[in-house]
């Protein structure tokens, strides 16, 4: 008795396809060993047609695949464009040779059955409508016209020209004639269901002189489209229901035993399980729409259906489209934290994965908004400026080639809590969802900047220090100047790192940045942060205002400085609209005066400078001759 199980017999018709599922026992060896499908010959030899090792025989080329689902302990053999030559005995099995564990499957492919020559076949999808054409002779023009549906014993009236209508067709069936043509009548039946399928007879007149026509109405449920997606990836259900339902509410539901539970609809309903990771997008006026789900979970696998109805709920007799979604746990998308926690006033560094083969793709970060049909406005991107309300506190750091980019958000408030998506303009499967939770801070922040009311005086020297706790001792500390194109890493000096003693003095750990001499372009947001290699950690931000030296000049408080930053940004946007050329991200040394200084800061500065994105120059035209940042000695 073989532990492999599957269908003993499979029958289909020419031109159609089959999907054969074979079940294997739940063991690690079985999950990873070779799966195969072979055809048994008269000699008892079984010739491999397809295997999970990538082998595909000539006769299956372009029309078959084999997919392993280790999480379900199954593998599926899909074969399309069947011919009668495919009839035969097969085995599905496991093992390095075709003599391993297997199950016998008999496949029979028959010819498409012939119908009597006088039968007209109408093939329609569920929810659609059909117009049946019923010809008759002129002498039957004044007679009663009718359409009836054949049952075992009799022919049950559907509709006739005396306006008699079967109760189950009220509001769905119409009998009419077109123009002055007195040799044909038509019956239209809308909102077709499976129960409408069957044989019909149209008739004009009575008795032996009556005109009759046989009609075979086939009502098809859409064959589910098979979707194979990786765990943590995303899926898009493209739904095309036709223009007759263009103005109806749209929905996507998931089959659950006896019902189809709505996941999302255009009336604002959304399943809480999909909060933060689903969008519904009407495409056009032809009834087309799409539903995008990110961060796929194992439990998302199942049978999905999209449809349209004024209620936004599944309704029999309305058009539908279906999918069978499989979620493969052997995913190429790395397992990242799906929840990131921060505290008010603090910061978060979110590592976003992307397809490493697409390192040059544009990276984005958007915030999922649940209102309406759901949308995800981009907050920052490699070629998208930071949204104004995130000024000074949001930046994207691209690390070309390593399959990750980092988004840092600081000065957190409880308003920032919510769902965010990492996405690129490349492989759409790599869209990932992060939930940001923000709790009220209960202790002092890890990084603190002094002085806190930072007002620098034009032409003078100005130093800011960033104090960090001993736990960050071994991490790389950095200062960067924020612009709406990124945060450009600057040369800085780590006071704590100079100490040769093994002990760590909590009070003396600081990293300083000096502006010498201070210029007007130095005004803006600066970040102090820690990182370990390419992994970014905490950050804190400070706004440095620049004032001319005046007698009795007073410090500007940070809120005024923030207001000024907003004004400055608005002015910059107005200016940049004058000349498109000036607004292009041209890689330039920015605050760095020479190559040596860039190298001193480390690889990150090189990467930032080269990318022209996250770490592109401030967008201010600075002279690099005399004014530059340098180490504080």
């Amino acid at each position: 008795k073989s532990p492999i199980f599957g269908p003993q017999e499979v029958s289909s018709i020419e031109g159609d396809s089959v999907s054969i599922t074979c079940y294997y026992p739940d063991t690690s060896v079985n999950r990873h060993t070779r799966k195969y499908w072979c055809r048994q010959g008269a000699s008892g030899m079984c010739t491999t047609l397809i295997s999970s090792n990538g082998y595909l025989s000539k006769e299956y080329s372009g029309r078959a695949n084999l997919i392993n689902f280790p999480e379900n302990n199954t593998f599926v053999i899909n074969i399309e464009q069947l011919t009668q030559d495919d009839t035969g005995s097969y085995k599905c099995g496991l093992g390095t040779s075709n003599r391993g564990l297997s199950f016998d499957v008999s496949l029979e492919v028959s010819q498409v059955p012939e119908l009597p020559s006088d039968t007209h076949v109408y093939t329609k999808d569920i929810g659609r409508n059909v117009t049946i054409e019923c010809p008759f002779k002129r002498e039957n023009a004044p007679s009663k016209k009718s359409l009836c549906k054949k049952t075992n014993q009799s022919c049950e009236l559907v509709i006739d020209s005396t306006e008699k209508v079967n109760p189950s067709y009220i509001g769905r069936a119409k009998l009419f004639m077109k123009g002055t043509d007195l040799t044909v009548f038509y019956v239209n039946i809308s909102h077709l269901t499976h129960n409408d399928a069957g044989l019909y007879i149209c008739q004009a007149g009575e008795g032996p002189s009556a005109d009759k026509k046989n009609v075979d109405l086939q009502v098809l449920a859409p064959e589910p489209e098979l979707l194979y997606k990786d765990l943590r990836s995303s899926v898009t259900f493209e739904c095309d229901l036709g223009r007759e339902v263009a103005n109806e509410a749209k929905y996507l539901c998931r089959m659950n035993k006896e019902t189809c539970d709505v996941i999302i609809n255009t009336l604002g309903k959304r399943d809480p399980d999909f909060e933060g990771r689903i969008l519904i997008t009407p495409k056009d006026d032809n009834g087309r729409f799409s539903v995008l789900i990110t961060g796929l979970r194992k439990e998302d696998a199942g049978h999905y259906q999209c449809g349209a109805h004024s209620s936004g709920l599944p309704q029999e007799g309305w058009p539908i489209q279906t999918w069978q979604l499989f979620v493969n746990e052997e995913s190429t998308i790395p397992n990242r934290r799906s929840v990131v926690k921060g505290v008010t006033g603090g910061s978060v560094a979110i590592a976003c994965p992307y397809n490493p083969k697409e390192s040059s793709s544009l990276k984005y970060w958007c915030r999922w908004e649940g209102d309406g049909n759901g949308h995800c406005p981009v907050l920052v991107g490699t070629q998208a400026q930071v949204q104004e309300e995130y000024e000074g506190r949001l930046a994207l750091f691209d690390q070309p080639g390593n399959g990750t980019y980092t988004v840092i958000l600081n000065q957190l408030t409880t308003e920032d809590a919510g769902f965010y998506w990492c996405l690129t303009n490349g492989d759409s499967r790599w869209r990932t969802t992060i939930e940001l939770q923000v709790a009220e801070a209960t202790r002092e922040p890890n990084l603190e900047v002094t002085p806190q009311n930072a007002t620098a005086v034009l032409g003078e020297t100005f130093t800011v220090s960033c104090h960090y706790p001993c736990k960050f001792y071994s991490q790389e500390k950095y200062w960067c100047k924020w612009s709406n194109k990124g945060c450009h890493i600057l040369p800085s000096h780590d006071e704590g790192a100079r100490q040769s003693s093994v002990s760590c003095d909590q009070s003396s750990q600081l990293v300083s940045m000096t502006l010498n001499p201070v210029s007007k372009e130095d005004e803006g947001w600066y970040w102090c942060g820690v990182k370990q290699g390419q992994t970014y950690g905490e950050t804190t931000a400070i706004y440095i205002a620049v004032e001319e030296r005046t007698r009795g000049s007073s410090h500007v408080n940070p809120t005024d400085a923030n207001a000024r930053a907003k004004v400055a940004l608005e002015e910059e946007v107005v200016d940049s609209s004058i000349s498109e050329k000036e607004n292009k991200a041209i890689p330039n040394p920015g605050p760095f005066a020479n190559e040596r200084e860039i190298q001193n800061v480390g690889d990150q500065a090189q990467e930032n400078r080269a990318s022209g994105d996250a770490g592109s120059a401030d967008g201010q035209s600075r002279s690099s001759s005399s004014k530059h940042h340098h180490h504080h000695h």
């Epitope: 199980f5 269908p7 396809s17 089959v18 499976h194 064959e223």
Partner: nanobody, 127 residues
Amino acid sequence: EVQLVESGGGLVQTGESLRLSCAASGRAFSDLRMAWFRQVPGKEREFVAAVEWRGSSRYYYSADSVKGRFTISRTSPKGETYLQMNGLKPEDTAVYYCAAVSPVVGDPRNSDTYNYWGQGTQVTVSS
């Protein structure tokens, strides 16, 4: 929604035959799996056989214990489902249940995957 009614059970001698029928009323499906399970008091439901209709293709499954003796059939996606039982043995004595699931999902042998069940019909095989 969907009602399943079994018939055809009864008392037979070892080696005789019986034909069970399962009539479905209510909704009609084109993507459907129909199955027969059986249960002996105090034991779990045991898979007997199943048939799937998916588009124009049909898939037939049966348990090792009944292979070559029992045949499941279904005339059309809307027709009745039959279980032809030949060469009956005393160990085939049980209540036989008809089950259905649409759309077709999961392992046909797993009773949890079915969403519609009949009331059952008793089959007794005496020696």
